[in-house]
């Protein structure tokens, strides 16, 4: 539009002035004047802003702590918080990852469709007609029933979705 | 303090093009939308459009369209100004000028606070 | 596009004058309208925006008036640094234009 309708993207109101906003990983000192620009200074150590901003403080650094199966996935810098994940065999609670749990292990009947992660659980399905899973694991997909016919051998007993089938030797009365 | 420190003196042939830099220091590049206008020797000032350096966005007078082209580097808070096909009465001299926003009676009124000083082309065969 | 008239085009005064520029507009610009003082060989300086707001750091004798399309510029007691160029500017309506200038010689 033109003119302007309000400050340009990058600016704020302030005393009748459009003031330039802070850049990402810089905060707000002190506002523009009439005879001065807009002071900003870096943000410190362990800390950042990640917009443009006028902040007067800058936000510390996520802490990643080992005692809640966290650890550093990507170090924080002044224009990015840190990004923490799981300890192995561990996955986030949440999206912000502030604490973990154990992978749930997919009980007989049961075999793993997608494997954990640092930030997902383990997603379990029931073995179809044809498969079992005898174990509890987090790991483990459903295998198929053995083929008794290729081993030359017939089905003694019949496979659950927690047990294999059982092959035996055929009858050679039938022979 | 602002400065916009603009690239030196430059003599093309007709038919070439010019590329003219405007480097900014003492404020935030990225905060204030950049102009361009230049001034024919004995002449007055003409209006050529602007460019938002935070996005790239360039908005150019109508009779500069298709010969005009306005572009920055932010890691360098430097704008730049080319224009092509020059002709004889292409010599000016190029100003880049810095906008500012004075906010009053509920509107927003820009106007030129801080200017280059000035890049001379010359079009001569 | 709005054009900007600027007069007189040519102004003879002393110093401790008090000095008047007008400059009109072709049509309506309620009060988006800057001045500017150029000399020889130099950028443009802002001097008033908003029709009359006083630039930080320019001395009080320059004030500017008017709103729509006719305004002014008054410098109520000219000064040797004030020998210069002129301009008036339209920030209502693409392109921003200028009016022609009036230069400001020493009589």
């Known amino acids: 539009p033109e003119p302007p309708t309000a400050c340009r993207e990058k600016q704020y109101l302030i005393n009748s002035q459009c003031c330039s906003l802070c850049q990402p990983g810089q905060k707000l000192v002190s506002d523009c004047t009439e005879f001065t620009e807009t002071e900003c200074l870096p943000c410190g150590e362990s800390e950042f802003l990640d917009t443009w901003n006028r902040e007067t403080h800058c936000h510390q650094h996520k802490y990643c702590d080992p005692n809640l199966g966290l650890r550093v996935q990507q170090k924080g810098t002044s224009e990015t918080d840190t990004i923490c994940t799981c300890e192995e065999g561990w996955h986030c609670t949440s999206e912000a990852c502030e604490s973990c749990v154990l992978h749930r292990s997919c009980s007989p009947g049961f075999g793993v469709k997608q494997i954990a992660t640092g930030v997902s659980d383990t997603i379990c399905e029931p073995c179809p007609v044809g498969f079992f899973s005898n174990v509890s694991s987090a790991f483990e997909k459903c295998h198929p029933w053995t083929s008794c016919e290729t081993k030359d051998l017939v089905v003694q007993q019949a496979g659950t979705n927690k047990t294999d089938v059982v092959c035996g030797p055929q009858d050679r009365l039938r022979a | 303090q602002v400065q916009l420190v603009q690239s030196g003196a430059e003599v093309k042939k007709p038919g070439a093009s010019v590329k003219v830099s405007c480097k900014a220091s003492g404020y935030t590049f990225a905060g204030y939308y950049m102009y361009w206008v230049r001034q024919a020797p004995g002449q007055g000032l003409e209006w050529m459009g602007w460019?938002?350096?935070?996005?790239?966005?360039?908005t150019y007078a109508q009779k500069f369209q298709g010969r005009v082209t306005m572009t920055r580097d932010t890691s360098i808070s430097t704008a730049y100004m080319e224009l092509s096909r020059l002709r004889s009465d292409d010599t000016a001299v190029y100003y880049c000028?810095?906008?500012?926003?004075?906010?009053?009676?509920?509107?927003?009124?820009?106007?030129?606070?801080?200017w280059g000083q000035g890049t001379l082309v010359t079009v001569s065969s | 596009d709005i054009q900007l008239t600027q007069s007189p085009s040519f102004l003879s005064a002393s110093v401790g004058d008090r000095v008047t520029i007008t400059c009109r507009a072709s049509?309506?610009?309620?009060?988006?309208l800057a001045w500017y003082q150029q000399k020889p060989g130099k950028a443009p300086k802002l001097l008033i925006y908003a029709a009359s707001t006083l630039q930080s750091g320019v001395p009080s004798r320059f004030s500017g008036s008017g709103s729509g399309t006719e305004f002014t510029l008054t410098i109520s007691s000219l000064q040797p640094e004030d020998f210069a160029t002129y301009y008036c500017q339209q920030l209502l309506s693409y392109p921003w234009t200028f009016g022609q200038g009036t230069k400001v010689e020493i009589k």
């Open positions: 000028a810095r906008e500012k926003i004075y906010y009053g009676s509920g509107n927003y009124y820009p106007s030129f606070d801080y």
């Open positions: 460019i938002n350096p935070d996005s790239g966005a360039p």
């Open positions: 049509q309506g610009i309620s009060s988006y």
